[in-house]
């Protein structure tokens, strides 16, 4: 590429840049452990940390677990991306009565308009059905005029919604105007959990939330309570507790009303990539070969390079790299690219503490 030579030469001698023949430009070389956010990075801000699958990089540059939409009443609205969480919403035919960060803590079935009422606004994932009288005059569905009282000015009658929680059952009935009962079949076997904090028959200022205990008369000590497996975060939002369901994790602290569950790597494993209240990647304690130590790589796809240990050092088989993360893997089979130059070793401090948990505690 003779025409590219002047441009290519501007990159030479500058180890922080390289020339990409495909785009015919000088590009910034992201430091080890960081990954480019575009094909030809131009500056350090174009390089970011890469999180494990099902984790995203939050505003504070932390790997945070994407919410799961595994509950039967939720569907995925947007997928988990490298820089944003998965977003869940209530499945079709339901709306969210108690929101949670990137998800919904409680979904209710859309109301069915009772006799004499028609749908003014259909229900959505966020809002319940809105009903209005079928005609401005007396509804033809009325059996007798005394049962056909017009709604008071400014109100739109609405059937009460059917709550749904992660518990299973078959159907739900609920009282509707005039003492009639309306049965709403759940498409999946879902209804309100028997111990659900909110009930159709009890007045509640905020569906899906309840006092943690009966409020003493005149006391304002009625804090908001979230659904099971959700906690109340600092902003007063119901947020999903992290799950420790992966085989390599164990629960360190349970999900409480005001704090998330925390997970840590199970015994015999060490956290290689930390995540908020959990560990994105656990690896077995390294078992070092006689003349090999692993070189840490914080790669998206767990590539690992191997090299000879620095002269005069003995691998202690429990190295903690400078960035505080354990090696991504102790098996060389996943990496195509191997360092054959022992002179390019990274010093591994043998006295550095080994992080057993990634919860920051």
């Amino acid at each position: 590429f003779p025409q590219d030579r002047p441009f290519e030469d501007t990159c030479h001698g500058n180890p922080s840049h390289y020339y990409d023949k495909a785009v015919r430009r000088c590009c910034y070389r992201c430091p080890m452990g960081l990954f480019p956010t575009q094909q030809c990075p131009q500056r350090p801000t174009d390089c970011r940390k890469q999180c494990e699958p099902d984790y995203y990089l939050d505003e504070a540059d932390r790997c945070t677990a994407c919410v799961t939409c595994s509950r039967d009443d939720l569907v995925e609205k947007t997928p988990c991306a490298w820089n944003s969480s998965r977003v869940c919403e209530c499945r079709p035919g339901m709306f969210c009565s108690t929101s949670a960060v990137n998800s919904c803590a409680r979904c209710f079935f859309h109301s069915v308009c009772p006799a004499g009422m028609i749908v003014k606004f259909p229900g959505t994932a966020q809002k319940n059905t809105v009903c209005e009288p079928a005609s401005p005059g007396v509804s033809p569905a009325c059996a007798s005029p005394e049962n056909c009282k017009e709604p008071s000015s400014g109100t739109i009658p609405q059937a009460k919604p059917t709550p749904v929680s992660p518990a299973t059952s078959s159907a739900s009935t609920m009282p509707v105007r005039g003492g009639t009962r309306l049965a709403q079949e759940a498409a999946s076997k879902l209804t309100r959990a028997p111990d659900s904090p909110s009930s159709v028959g009890r007045p509640s200022s905020d569906p899906g939330l309840s006092p943690t205990q009966p409020c003493p008369e005149g006391s304002g000590d009625c804090r908001k309570q979230c659904e099971p497996d959700y906690y109340l975060d600092e902003a007063g939002r119901c947020t999903a507790c992290v799950s420790c369901s992966r085989d390599d994790l164990v629960e360190k602290t349970p999900c409480a009303w005001n704090s998330s569950r925390t997970c840590e790597c199970r015994p015999g494993m060490i956290c290689a990539t930390s995540a908020t209240n959990s560990c994105a990647r656990c690896v077995p304690y390294p078992i070092c070969a006689a003349e090999t130590v692993t070189k840490p790589q914080d790669m998206a796809e767990k590539d690992t390079t191997f090299e000879a240990p620095p002269l005069g050092t003995q691998p202690d088989c429990n190295p903690t790299p400078e960035n505080g993360e354990a090696p991504a893997s102790t098996s060389p089979t996943q990496s195509l690219l191997v360092d054959s130059q022992a002179s390019k070793t990274l010093p591994i401090p043998t006295s550095a503490p080994v992080a057993l948990s990634s919860t920051g505690k």
Epitope: Y18, F35, P36, Q39, P41, A300, D303
Partner: nanobody, 123 residues
């Protein structure tokens, strides 16, 4: 010094096959993606195929899909391009490149390049 060295090019008849190799030596800086590019005489550089080396995910240009196969041999630090059903329009210098997967995308940076190997498809 990082080096990518291509080999396996040569003259082949239309419909024939060739297997290109790319041997990686030296420490490839944080690389988790390798690919093949080609440049036909008097034309620009064209992306052919890439492999994400950790996951093994492969991607191909439409012009070679179903005919070319990219693969890796971790034990030999070698990248391959198996080319079948070769056509005259596949004649080009083939380059091996290594880099990193771009976050949130399937494209890669191309931080390291080989010198190329010539493939000529002609009867």
């Amino acid at each position: 010094e990082v080096q990518l060295v291509e080999s396996g090019g040569g003259l082949v008849q239309p419909g024939g096959s060739l297997r290109l190799s790319c041997a990686a030596s030296g420490y490839i800086y944080s690389s988790n993606c390798m690919g093949w590019f080609r440049q036909a005489p008097g034309k620009g550089l064209e992306w052919v195929a890439r492999i994400h080396t950790g996951s093994g995910s492969t991607y191909y240009a439409d012009s070679v899909k179903g005919r070319f196969t990219i693969s890796q041999d971790n034990s030999k630090n070698t990248l391959y391009l198996q080319m079948n059903s070769l056509r005259a329009e596949d004649t080009a210098v083939y380059y091996c490149a290594a880099g990193r997967v771009v976050l949130g995308a399937v494209v890669c940076t191309n931080e390291y390049w080989g010198q190329g190997t010539l493939v000529t498809v002609s009867s």
